[in-house]
Structure formats: structure tokens, C-alpha cells
């Protein structure tokens, strides 16, 4: 099966790499604009220069293109705890990330929030915190893992998953209560 090409891809594929078909004259191949620039005017004829202009402040193009406008620079989302790793330049978008001892949780493909790495109190670090993944903790005896925190088995309700992990402790508590009755 031949993959379906969009109109722009069809037009580009007729020209050699680094060139695109003139939108008004399909016998002309114009040179694409370099990254950091955008298309101001198509080339007037074969072998003639495309009129490319540099992106203005607050915008960029990261690859060769024939875009009529540069792309707007991304802004790091303060409300999501994001910080700027590197600022936007004419040929590269802003890079956002998280502070030290934080990880990124992606709510969707292009939206992440920064959260503090778990410290594994009342447990040990099984896997260290990574850029896109929280610490994985293993809990000490008498504690169970709830939302990546080690919680005392005294907080384990019988209906919860923790009953398997806390079973000896639950029985001890029950045994203690029973022995207290006369």
C-alpha cells in the first residue's frame, strides 16, 4: 500500500531535498529557509533566492522550513512547578524542566507537572528518582506502600490491599485486644 501523502508532502516530494515547490508555479523549486528564519517571499524563479527573514524575538523555527510565520516560543508553566532550563532562541524552543530532587509527571504528551521525589521515609530506596519517574520505595516491616509513601500498618483498614502486607501486625493488634479482655 502507498502511504497517503498530504498536499504539502506531495508538493515537497517533487523537488530535491532542501527545496519545495513554488505554490503558484509547480515547475519551480525554491530553496527552503534555514532554521531560525521563515519564508517572507517565495523565490521568483529557478535558481533565484528565496526571501527568508530571521524570526523575531519570542519566536523560532527549529528546522529548515517554508513556514510563513515563525512558531511562538513555549513558556514554562509556573503553576505546574516548571522552571526554564534554557531560554528560547531563533532556532530552538524554550526548554522547561523541574528543580533538583523533583521529577516530571506527564498528564498528557505535552503537559508535565513537577513533583518532589519521594524520600522513602520508613523504607529504603529500591530505584532512585529519575527525570520522568519518582523514586520506587520498599517499606520496612510494619509499614505498607500507599501512594509511594510508607505508611504505618496501624493505618491499614481490613478492606484495603495493605491487609496482605500487614497481616501479621493486624493479627498482633487483634491478639493484644483479645488478651486484654477478662
Amino acid at each position: 500500500l502507498v502511504p497517503h501523502l498530504g498536499d504539502r508532502e506531495k508538493r515537497d516530494s517533487v523537488c530535491p531535498q532542501g527545496k519545495y515547490i513554488h505554490p503558484q508555479n509547480n515547475s519551480i523549486c525554491c530553496t527552503k529557509c534555514h532554521k531560525g528564519t521563515y519564508l517572507y517571499n517565495d523565490c521568483p524563479g529557478p535558481g533565484q533566492d528565496t526571501d527568508c527573514r530571521e524570526c523575531e524575538s519570542g519566536s523560532f523555527t527549529a528546522s529548515e522550513n517554508h513556514l510563513r510565520h515563525c512558531l511562538s516560543c513555549s513558556k514554562c508553566r509556573k503553576e505546574m512547578g516548571q522552571v526554564e532550563i534554557s531560554s528560547c532562541t531563533v532556532d530552538r524552543d524554550t526548554v522547561c524542566g523541574c528543580r533538583k530532587n523533583q521529577y516530571r509527571h506527564y498528564w498528557s504528551e505535552n503537559l508535565f507537572q513537577c513533583f518532589n521525589c519521594s524520600l522513602c521515609l520508613n523504607g529504603t530506596v529500591h530505584l532512585s528518582c529519575q527525570e520522568k519517574q519518582n523514586t520506587v520505595c520498599t517499606c520496612h516491616a510494619g509499614f505498607f506502600l500507599r501512594e509511594n509513601e510508607c505508611v504505618s500498618c496501624s493505618n491499614c483498614k481490613k478492606s484495603l490491599e495493605c491487609t496482605k502486607l500487614c497481616l501479621p501486625q493486624i493479627e498482633n493488634v487483634k491478639g493484644t485486644e483479645d488478651s486484654g479482655t477478662t
Epitope: 503553576e79 509527571h105 498528564w107 513533583f115 501512594e147
Partner: nanobody, 119 residues
């Protein structure tokens, strides 16, 4: 006790509009960034939009950009979602929630309001 109560859902034809509201109580609403998420039948939660504390900074999922508008009225402790040019794929239960703080889970969210887009 924290309460979030969504309203405004219903049956609407493709291309139609709805305005969802979320009445908040039990916490300082003006201090919390707020979120709209949705769950389509048989699918997972999808982040739709969020808004910062003062209503200046907003975010929209690509699927709703240009059609939905999030806003808030801190004097009324209410969050809104104006939904225009509705499509069948917008059919879902819509929930409001406060932006998670300690980890990737919603500490407080409402019971949801069902939006059905169908002709």
C-alpha cells in the same frame, strides 16, 4: 469538608454549546489552580484545561484548543468551562479538581457532569 459540585452538562447537538460550572467550598478557592478533566465512556482520564489562581494563565489540550474556554470567578468560588463547536468525541463525564500538589493524583474532585454530543 472540601466539596466540588459540577453542573451544566446535558445533551447537545454537534456544533452546539454548553457552559459547565463548578462550585467550590471547604477550601480557599482563590489559592488553588483548578483543572477540568474528562472521562469518555470506556476511556481513561483526559486533562482538558487548567487555570492558575488568578485566572491569567490557562492551558488547553490540543483536542479542545480554540473551542473551549476556562475561566474562574474567585468572588463566587466558581470555575467555568465554556464549550463551543461541540463534537461527538467531546462526549464524556467532566470533572473539576484542584491541581494536585504532593503527587500525581487528584486529592479533591467533584462527582462529575455528563456531556453528551449527539444528533
Amino acid at each position: 469538608e472540601v466539596q466540588l459540585l459540577e453542573s451544566g452538562g446535558g445533551l447537545v447537538q454537534p456544533g452546539g454549546s454548553l457552559r459547565l460550572s463548578c462550585a467550590a467550598s471547604g477550601f480557599t478557592f482563590a489559592h488553588e489552580p483548578m483543572v477540568w478533566v474528562r472521562q469518555a465512556p470506556g476511556k481513561g482520564l483526559e486533562w482538558v484545561s487548567h487555570i492558575d489562581r488568578v485566572g491569567q494563565d490557562t492551558y488547553y489540550a490540543d483536542s479542545v484548543k480554540g473551542r473551549f474556554t476556562i475561566s474562574r470567578d474567585n468572588s463566587k468560588n466558581t470555575l467555568y468551562l465554556q464549550m463551543n463547536s461541540l463534537r461527538a468525541e467531546d462526549t464524556a463525564v467532566y470533572y473539576c479538581a484542584s491541581l494536585p500538589k504532593r503527587g500525581p493524583r487528584f486529592d479533591y474532585w467533584g462527582q462529575g457532569t455528563l456531556v453528551t454530543v449527539s444528533s
